[in-house]
């Protein structure tokens, strides 16, 4: 049977997927083949082949950036090192072990769902803007995070969520495979506003908040706070 | 233990059609690519058809454009549409397993007959 | 397409001789070479694979070797159970190509 496990891994950084027999495990290196390749379209991402040193099967997206241990396969040890890690990263990974000498049997069989995040920019929110006599215009912009974010605008006063109906949010893919989010929020003008924009990342468990006041219409974007005073279901940030 | 069971051989009318299966277990199957391979009474063995694990598939010129080889990893499945039929197609047709990255067929189902005949 | 010549066709041996076999490609086919053992009315069974790997479970009197174009399938001393017919495939490219096969019969 296929095990399966999780992982999670920040962009740019060196991550190990895991694929191993019980301590104890002894392997002949000119008796096993082991095959990496993503579950979904089977691109191929690193092997080891009895007296093959060569890897000209390795997708050019993988080559030279992920490796296994030599001396970790004796050990029955064959999990993979992925270098650099990118949003196109997250996906399934299937090691799979064969035995020459059980003819060709499966000794090993593991899956690996490889979660990738990357932290937003603090929000940058725009003083507000009155596109008519009786309305308030904030816009939100954060970039260069991973996954797709929520966002959510808040009445600092008694961080209460504002009605998301209020707000229109856009999310972009950028070149980097990161996204970059503008949401702008739309509201009745009143003597003074209180609000913030909060941006949560959830793979992260982390929100990511800036406050904007009017009061006779002067805006701040001094209140700069990283996992906010709990506003509903919101988590403090932490990395698991 | 690693097996190919195959099924859905059988009589057909020249320019008929005919559906083989071939069920593996004991392996990951949705890892592997899945050939068919088949074998004229008295002649030898002729390649037919190949799927990859990642779906992409490859044909005989003698079978382009009448056969469609697929699968279905939930059943853990192969199949060998058959359409338009000759009487050179009869054969026994064998499905066989390729030995990850290695390539050759390392496991053989047992075979089943296609008779093309008016 | 990769042709690929089986010699001879058949063959005619006792229990005891050593037989060789040859298979040549028609173009270099580095070591992506394998030989099937086949007997009536039964799949064929992988002998050898890489020209000269043993398929695990295959008596150590089966051996392969060659690299390139010319191959040869050598048992080194014929046992009642290996009297069959004998293929060589090549698996460098598609389509995949068996040689015509060679008939091993009791002398």
């Known amino acids: 049977d296929t095990q399966e496990k999780e992982v999670r891994a920040m962009v740019g950084s060196d991550v190990e997927l895991s694929c191993a027999c019980p301590e104890g495990s002894r392997f002949d290196l000119n008796d096993v083949y082991v095959y990496w390749q993503t579950s979904e379209s089977k691109t191929v991402v690193t092997y080891h082949i009895p007296q093959n040193s060569s890897l000209e099967n390795v997708d050019s997206r993988y080559r030279n950036r992920a490796l296994m241990s030599p001396a970790g396969m004796l050990r029955g040890d064959f999990s993979l090192r992925l270098f650099n890690v990118t949003p196109q990263d997250e996906q399934k990974f299937h090691c799979l072990v064969l035995s020459q000498s059980l003819g060709f049997q499966e000794v090993l069989s593991v899956e690996v769902t490889l979660h990738v995040a990357a932290n937003f920019s603090v929000p940058v929110v725009s003083a507000p803007h009155s596109p008519s006599q009786d309305e308030l215009t904030f816009t939100c912009t954060s970039i260069n995070g991973y996954p797709r974010p929520n966002v959510y605008w808040i009445n600092k006063t008694d961080n209460s969520l504002l009605d998301q109906a209020l707000q229109n949010d856009t999310v972009f893919l950028n070149m980097r495979g990161l996204y970059d989010v503008v949401s702008v929020l739309r509201i009745a003008r009143t003597p003074s506003v209180n609000i913030g924009c909060c941006i949560e990342n959830v793979l992260l468990q982390q929100n990511l908040t800036v406050g904007s006041q009017t009061g006779n219409d002067i805006g701040e974007r001094d209140k700069i706070t990283e996992n906010p005073v709990s506003t509903g279901e919101k988590n403090a940030a932490t990395w698991s | 233990e690693v097996q190919l069971v195959q099924s859905g051989g059988g009589l057909v009318h020249p320019g008929g059609s005919l559906r083989l299966s071939c069920a593996g277990s004991?392996?990951?199957?949705?890892?592997?690519?899945m050939h068919w391979v088949r074998q004229a009474p008295g002649k030898g063995l002729e390649w037919v058809s190949a799927?990859?694990?990642?779906?992409?598939?490859y044909y005989a010129d003698s079978v382009k454009g009448r056969f469609t080889i697929s699968r279905d990893n939930a059943k853990n499945s192969l199949y060998l549409q058959m359409n338009s039929l000759r009487a050179e197609d009869m054969a026994v047709y064998y499905c066989?397993?390729?030995?990850?990255?290695?390539?050759?067929?390392?496991?053989w189902g047992q075979g089943t007959l296609v008779t093309v005949s008016s | 397409d990769i042709q690929m010549t089986q010699s001879p066709s058949s063959l005619s041996a006792s229990v005891g001789d050593r037989v060789t076999i040859t298979c040549r490609a028609s173009q270099g086919i580095s070591s992506w070479l394998a030989w099937y053992q086949q007997k009536p009315e039964k799949a064929p069974k992988s002998l050898i694979f890489?020209?000269?790997s043993l398929q695990s479970g295959v008596p150590s009197r089966f051996s392969g070797s060659g690299s390139g174009t010319d191959f040869t399938l050598t048992i080194s001393s014929l046992q009642p159970e290996d009297f069959a017919t004998y293929y060589c495939?090549?698996?460098?490219?598609?389509?995949?190509?068996f040689g015509q096969g060679t008939k091993l019969e009791i002398k």
């Open positions: 004991g392996f990951t199957f949705s890892s592997y690519a």
């Open positions: 890489a020209a000269s």
């Open positions: 799927i990859g694990a990642g779906g992409g598939t």
């Open positions: 495939q090549q698996y460098n490219s598609y389509p995949y190509t």
């Open positions: 066989a397993r390729v030995v990850v990255v290695v390539g050759f067929f390392d496991y």
